[in-house]
Amino acid sequence: AGVFELQIHSFGPGPGPGAPRSPCSARLPCRLFFRVCLKPGLSEEAAESPCALGAALSARGPVYTEQPGAPAPDLPLPDGLLQVPFRDAWPGTFSFIIETWREELGDQIGGPAWSLLARVAGRRRLAAGGPWARDIQRAGAWELRFSYRARCEPPAVGTACTRLCRPRSAPSRCGPGLRPCAPLEDECEAPLVCRAGCSPEHGFCEQPGECRCLEGWTGPLCTVPVSTSSCLSPRGPSSATTGCLVPGPGPCDGNPCANGGSCSETPRSFECTCPRGFYGLRCEVSGVTCADGPCFNGGLCVGGADPDSAYICHCPPGFQGSNCEKRVDRCSLQPCRNGGLCLDLGHALRCRCRAGFAGPRCEHDLDDCAGRACANGGTCVEGGGAHRCSCALGFGGRDCRERADPCAARPCAHGGRCYAHFSGLVCACAPGYMGARCEFPVHPDGASALPAAPPGLRPGDPQRYL
């Protein structure tokens, strides 16, 4: 665990004669605040994905009023650092977005107005515990200067904050094989002792005494390869005997979302859907008003001039959630046909088609009937870039592999009762009707509108459909 710290040094007009006017005026005094969003740097997530490493808002800066005729200077900044706590290991490579917001303090109806002045982004490599790293970035006509660092919270140390320190047991030196904990020289590095027997290749621990398995391995000591063939449940930990994943604690167990947030599992972890008035990875940020710029991804904030009155985020197309923090999962509509894999790239949807299929939505069957077997005596019928099977009696489905229920379509007319038979179906007709499907009424004088019934069958007896 640790804290990412961001220090804003200056925000002002960039160099050159085309410097912007001050964002504040005598008529509209204003003040600045900043928002930082952090993500693991090498994640494959879309640009608009949530701030998985955390986010923070600064305090408001001092009120500033433009001096008429004077060039826009660097604007007065909020005091202090922006701090983003992280619970797990520091990833080493991270992405950041820093936004500069203006709060206008004029006589707007409904309280102050907020607007985004500038946004900068980058991906950097940074070891925890290292010195402050500096950056200068331009955004439009503005220039932002800032420094950042990641530091571990005791007892964690190391470049990823995964090693632990503890006070020395002896005053002079650390135990055998243990180093002093720089910079805490009076402490010793604590050996991270995993559960006894935990596989050194396939297991690891972040807390002493635990044994967490790498993907593909399971069991209390991570010695059992995961076998997916005979397993029904999607997650672990596992049964050491079968190697199957059995239902175990999921990321949402115990609901990590605070303040009434609802938890949903994601492939990597979990995601909190926060009630209005709260946001953050675990809905832990509260007392939010529009002044805090809670609407992400260009959402428009309405209402909420004070912490007690809720705000509403009006989200742009493609985003949803009380803070516009979630991309609309366009893949949930399952647009890819024929088992294609859906990829939401942000700017577009892409379907990765299974072998034998093509087209933007995998709608074209390249095989047609070539090499396509229809089971159970069915015949393949070509047409329109796709194939279909014309199935023999008693079979159905795409490849005639499903045993059809011949009675499912209610083929017996006029209240006749249907019986499935190995070679098809049999209709037992209601009194007064006859025919293979009971489709013909029997005339009152006993004669039929049809030729006489076959020998051995009286009108009204079940007619076998051949």
Epitope: P15, G16, A46, A47, I97, R119, V120, A121, G122, R123, R124, R125, R134, D135, I136, Q137, R138, A139, G140, E143, G346
Partner: antibody, heavy 117, light 107 residues
Framework: QVQLVQSGAEVKKPGASVKVSCKAS????????IHWIRQAPGQGLEWMGY????????EFNQNFKDRVTMTRDTSTSTVYMELSSLRSEDTAVYYC??????????WGQGTTVTVSS | AIQLTQSPSSLSASVGDRVTITCRAS??????LAWYQQKPGKAPKLLIY???SLEDGVPSRFSGSGSGTDFTLTISSLQPEDFATYFC?????????FGGGTKLEIK
Amino acid sequence: QVQLVQSGAEVKKPGASVKVSCKASGYTFTRYWIHWIRQAPGQGLEWMGYINPTTVYTEFNQNFKDRVTMTRDTSTSTVYMELSSLRSEDTAVYYCARGGSNFFDHWGQGTTVTVSS
Amino acid sequence: AIQLTQSPSSLSASVGDRVTITCRASENIYYNLAWYQQKPGKAPKLLIYTANSLEDGVPSRFSGSGSGTDFTLTISSLQPEDFATYFCKQAYDVPPTFGGGTKLEIK
């Protein structure tokens, strides 16, 4: 106005070192970083690294990490880039440029370095 | 490192034409893209930064657009002095990388 003036052309033998200077004027020297970018004949541009004149912090492209050194002299507002263990493929025009991490807004005129035996 | 692919690699056009050059990044770089103009024997000159911000002193016929992975430099009406080579550069990740260049020639 902002100006970056570089030292003159150099001819070096393989294995030797070259030191190119870049003198800044027209702005507060310590306010912006100085980057170095090179361009081999008929080729594209390749970023080598930068120095922050305030802190003397440097960051390099991994391709040059072990061979390049960047220094500065604040009294003359000059930055130096030294490239060692020269080989023929280091023949290029070397540019210094003022900027931050996402802009190089003023460039020197370039210094041609020829490596030939 | 992030790769930038510029297209076309060369282009012939006439004075007064509207010209578009594209730059595609190998991954999302948000809006961290700059465009530079370079004339033979000269240093590159910054035209556009952060995808669409025009550098001071650059004529307004130059404009930039795009974000994420796809970016465009447009010259609305070519002037004789615009015939040069144009490079895009990403500044999202370290090291900054340049596109291969587009040589704009007189037709």
